[in-house]
């Protein structure tokens, strides 16, 4: 008996960190449900999150197939309990997302300092190489595996007894810095992709300080 009123989704937003990627939208559904489709610029549409009352859809499984591709998603609105029904133009209402290129846009997750080791007046600080959901040859790739030379880390370090910070950079996951003998230092790291224009930097890692159990001290 005619079409049931539905409203189109709006504010379609990509939320992505270390390639874990969720599309969010509004409004909360009232008497309607949603289905999401995703495609690359040259590919076919693939449906996900069928007839859901959620206002988000996890699209990670699709985008990790090729994180350097550019993706477009769209959200269809259907009347609840009558998903065959269509809008006035003879097809369900839908709204397109912005384009999304994971490699260029996914947020860098907060890094973690894996360990630090002091040998005399040098400290080696190692950053955990976080696993992503990107696969190659049936193994999950780490952040370094995916970004390679594009990813650097910045280390902030300071004496526990003062506030003056120093910085160091590395294109690996390790830093080797000079420290003053007999002083305790605190460390924080940040992941950076210098070539980006958006989402260039992660948030800072939790601070780790010497004299706590994460590190190791060896007097040589």
């Amino acid at each position: 008996s005619g079409t049931t009123n539905t409203v189109a989704a709006y504010n379609l937003t990509w939320k992505s960190t270390n390639f874990k990627t969720i599309l969010e939208w509004e409004p909360k559904p009232v008497n309607q449900v949603y289905t999401v489709q995703i495609s690359t610029k040259s590919g076919d549409w693939k449906s996900k999150c069928f007839y859901t009352t959620d206002t988000e859809c996890d699209l990670t499984d699709e985008i990790v197939k090729d994180v350097k591709q550019t993706y477009l998603a769209r959200v269809f609105s259907y009347p609840a309990g009558n998903v065959e029904s269509t809008g006035s133009a003879g097809e369900p209402l839908y709204e397109n997302s912005p384009e999304f290129t994971p490699y260029l846009e996914t947020n860098l997750g907060q890094p973690t300092i894996q360990s630090f080791e002091q040998v005399g007046t040098k400290v080696n600080v190692t950053v955990e190489d976080e696993r992503t959901l990107v696969r190659r040859n049936n193994t999950f790739l780490s952040l370094r595996d995916v970004f390679g030379k594009d990813l650097i880390y910045t280390l902030y370090y300071w004496k526990s007894s003062s506030s003056g910070k120093k910085t160091a950079k590395t294109n690996t996951n390790e830093f080797l810095i000079d420290v003053d003998k007999g002083e305790n230092y605190c460390f924080s790291v940040q992941a950076v992709i210098p070539s980006r224009t958006v989402n260039r930097k992660s948030t800072d890692s939790p601070v780790e300080c010497m004299g706590q159990e994460k590190g190791e001290f060896r007097e040589i």
Epitope: K41, K68, Q69, T70, T101, Y103, L104, R136, G148, K149, N171, T172, P194, S195, R196, T197
Partner: antibody, heavy 116, light 109 residues
Framework: QVQLKQSGAELMKPGASVKISCKAT????????IEWVKQRPGHGLEWIGE????????NYNEKFKGKATFTADTSSNTAYMQLSSLTSEDSAVYYC??????????WGQGTTLTVS | QAVVTQESALTTSPGETVTLTCRSS?????????ANWVQEKPDHLFTGLIG???NRAPGVPARFSGSLIGDKAALTITGAQTEDEAIYFC?????????FGGGTKLTVL
Amino acid sequence: QVQLKQSGAELMKPGASVKISCKATGYTFSSYWIEWVKQRPGHGLEWIGEILPGSGSTNYNEKFKGKATFTADTSSNTAYMQLSSLTSEDSAVYYCAREDRYDGDYWGQGTTLTVS
Amino acid sequence: QAVVTQESALTTSPGETVTLTCRSSTGAVTTSNYANWVQEKPDHLFTGLIGGTNNRAPGVPARFSGSLIGDKAALTITGAQTEDEAIYFCALWYSNHWVFGGGTKLTVL
């Protein structure tokens, strides 16, 4: 399939400038670094620099700073290298290449520049 | 700037295994140098073989493999074919720039 097609041979006068183009097809142009490489007989390959089209970010070999300038147009999937203040030392074959350590480097066919 | 050194020429026979190496003047080559191997055949035909030390590009025959041997990057051709006769260039990444080696002319006869 991935292809990089470069502009044709150029014959230029000393002091002039030239712009070489590199049209990419078959992949997402914005996400891959485009490398520029110089080849002269007896000199092997020289890396000039690179550009990431999606952001416009560039890295240059110190030797070519002031000589080469990279740009990219994502609407036409084309990268460009401009060489300025040409001398006979700039006579060479120039290549663009798409860099990717998993999917392999793809090279253009080369553009021969003669400065005379 | 770092200097990257390759054997200038090597000769092998069909079916033999041959290893080409790539040395850095700054010390041991590591995975952070993302060693790249490219083949040049006549008429300016370049083909990427190996990226990131040991990732073989799609379509490249399995006889080509990349690795680190000692303090150098290496390209090994296991069971060389006559069509592998070419010049092979390695390139190493140093924080913000690539440096090419001088190339190895491989003869297969």
